[in-house]
Amino acid sequence: SEIVGGRRARPHAWPFMVSLQLRGGHFCGATLIAPNFVMSAAHCVANVNVRAVRVVLGAHNLSRREPTRQVFAVQRIFENGYDPVNLLNDIVILQLNGSATINANVQVAQLPAQGRRLGNGVQCLAMGWGLLGRNRGIASVLQELNVTVVTSLCRRSNVCTLVRGRQAGVCFGDSGSPLVCNGLIHGIASFVRGGCASGLYPDAFAPVAQFVNWIDSIIQRSEDNPCPHPRDPDPASRTH
């Protein structure tokens, strides 16, 4: 999904924000969660040749050449029971083929504690390079949008948000992008109902706090085993 009704982010205000690209075009967002790992929505890569994906860090304006960027390929994929029918567990971790250089424009995001739930009315920030609206193109400059957490019409298996009083929300191309609440990544943009930014239903995010132990175990495993295990399949293999 892309952000509809938002505003331009300050350049590199969100240095953990990642663009996933195919043939030079943005198709989903992601979040840098370790120097060599990004987190996105599972549906973003479900039908994609992951070997062709480029993971772009340090970007702001996708239509410009930016010296701040660091570009990686995907070495390995970790999924956690993604259910495309019921849109559950819409989370994927992509291991990069190298480690990012951490600097002012590229930084690792902070995650909440395992199981931490957001209450109704919490103010958060959604972001992304998704569509700017119906019949409008994809954003060149990263957009951000203030949203409110809602618990009505939202499963426990999601974090949901709504913008009250106007038509705004996430849209195509924003999928996989982070939802930032109190400085922590609490959501991964997953799906919308009633069309982009309809304001008629909450936007749904994968609930990062429900997956923190799993995320930590993957990052920890890679630190313990920096080299791929001999039995591991070839690069960009999927691991559940």
Epitope: S152, L153, L200
Partner: nanobody
């Protein structure tokens, strides 16, 4: 079985007000956005207004903006349309309709209630 039953229509003079109701049953009313749509004699359907699942967001056709107000009461599963400053061009059969969240379509309609604005 989903049922939507409109009421409150009638004959009214220009400039007067009318309040339409729509009683909903057979589904979890509070989970859905709801719409009002109208059809003037010999004309096509015209979308009038929509209210979000929780009532926080409301949108209107330009032709009724500032005159009509959509509201809902989830405790009684009822949708309302308050119509003020009615005009002759508001004469139509008014339908309430249930939203289909995934499709940007309306999947269930009521039988309609006729509003005639005439002096």
């Amino acid at each position: 079985e989903v049922q939507l039953v409109e009421s409150g229509g009638g004959v009214v003079q220009p400039g007067r007000s009318l309040r339409l109701s729509c009683a909903a049953s057979g589904f979890t009313f509070s989970n859905y956005a709801m719409h009002w749509v109208r059809q003037a004699p010999g004309k096509g359907l015209e979308w009038v207004a929509v209210i979000s699942y929780d009532g926080s967001n409301k949108y209107y056709a330009d032709s009724v903006k500032g005159r009509f107000t959509i509201s809902r009461d989830d405790s009684t599963n009822t949708l309302y349309l308050q119509m003020n400053n009615l005009r002759a061009e508001d004469t139509a059969v008014y339908y309430c309709a249930k939203d289909l969240p995934w499709e940007w379509e309306l999947d269930y309609w009521g039988q309609g209630t006729l509003v005639t604005v005439s002096s």
